[in-house]
């Protein structure tokens, strides 16, 4: 079954015009390593106030949801990948 995780909304401290762009800055899914992506004007909260948010995992900013989530390392789970599975 599909697990829908919690996401955390970063505080809104920018104006809409400062934040708006044409393309997201998440990783390209095709096989081109994202080299055709343009430079981004927006700041990724994962590099700022959420840089230490994911304890045992990688912080990901989801632009569509204006929220951060964690991609946990193996054996870890939870909103911040702070819990270890007992396997």
């Amino acid at each position: 079954s599909v697990r829908v995780e919690q996401v955390v909304k970063p505080p809104q401290n920018k104006t809409e015009s400062e934040n708006t762009s044409d393309k997201p800055k998440r990783k390209k899914k095709g096989g081109k390593n994202g080299k055709n992506r343009r430079n981004r004007k927006k700041k990724n909260p994962c590099n700022a106030e959420f840089q230490n948010f994911c304890i045992h995992g990688e912080c990901k900013y989801i632009e569509h949801l204006e929220a951060v989530t964690c991609k946990c390392q193996q054996e870890y789970f939870g909103e911040r990948c702070g819990e270890k599975s007992m396997k």
């Epitope: 697990r3 995780e5 708006t20 997201p24 899914k29 095709g30 632009e63 569509h64 991609k71």
Partner: antibody, heavy 125, light 112 residues
């Protein structure tokens, strides 16, 4: 019941402007990204614009960039599309659509899970 | 931009038989084993309706005769057994992270 209802379509001359609205009901509007998708007279589907949950991020294809502006009013549960410098090739049925999504293991997968009935835009002199 | 090519453009299938629709992407729509491709059904005078998301997940409430498969650049929508109400046009759509979010050209299914 989850519903989207578009309005504002009509006949407009080339170079003219039009503003479409989409009223949402039956779900928590500010929890979903939203898009406009159009269908040409040849029945081709074309993505037109997307806006994030709070309106901070907007996305457009090159064909409408600089001419169309997507916006939302979460207090009114309404999505908008301001269209200017309209061209004959913008003639289409315009749908608003909700981005359903899966979020798991750090992955975000989305799809258009709810569509409105559409509003017709005709650009002709 | 990722181009999605559907084939055939139209097909006629006998009641109770299998309909197979192909969608080929100009580059991979996979990332880390996840396929970012969706299928929609559209009947005349109606908006498109979500059928399959993430390549193989059937939208809730829809009959199990619809199934999706594939990965990378090659995807397939199967309908079996086909019923009268399945007469419609079917579209694939990719939802990778970088816009534009493109659709295939559509496949019109006729029931014989």
């Amino acid at each position: 019941e989850v519903q989207l209802q578009e309005s504002g379509g009509g006949l407009v001359k080339p170079g003219g402007s039009l503003k479409l609205s989409c009223a949402a009901s039956g779900f928590t509007f500010n929890s979903y990204a939203m898009s406009w998708v159009r269908q040409t007279p040849e029945k081709r589907l074309e993505w037109v614009a997307t806006i994030s949950t709070g309106g901070s991020h907007t996305y457009y294809p090159d064909s409408v960039k600089g001419r169309f502006t997507i916006s939302r009013d979460n207090a009114k549960n309404t999505l908008y599309l301001q269209m200017s410098s309209l061209r004959s090739e913008d003639t289409a049925m315009y749908y608003c659509a909700r981005h359903g999504y899966l979020l798991y293991d750090g992955y975000y997968e989305w799809y258009f899970d709810v569509w409105g009935a559409g509003t017709t835009v005709t650009v002709s002199s | 931009d990722i181009v999605l090519t559907q084939s055939p453009a139209s097909l006629a299938v006998s009641l109770g038989q299998r309909a197979t629709i192909s969608c080929k992407a100009s580059q991979s729509v996979d990332y880390d084993g996840h396929s970012f491709l969706n299928w929609y059904q559209q009947k005349p005078g109606q908006p498109p309706k979500l059928l399959i998301y993430a390549a193989s997940n059937l939208e809730s409430g829809l009959p199990a005769r619809f199934s999706g498969s594939g990965s990378g650049t090659d995807f397939t929508l199967n309908i079996h057994p086909v019923e009268e109400e399945d007469a419609a046009t079917y579209y694939c759509q990719q939802s990778t992270e970088d816009p534009p979010y493109t659709f295939g050209g559509g496949t019109k299914l006729e029931i014989k």
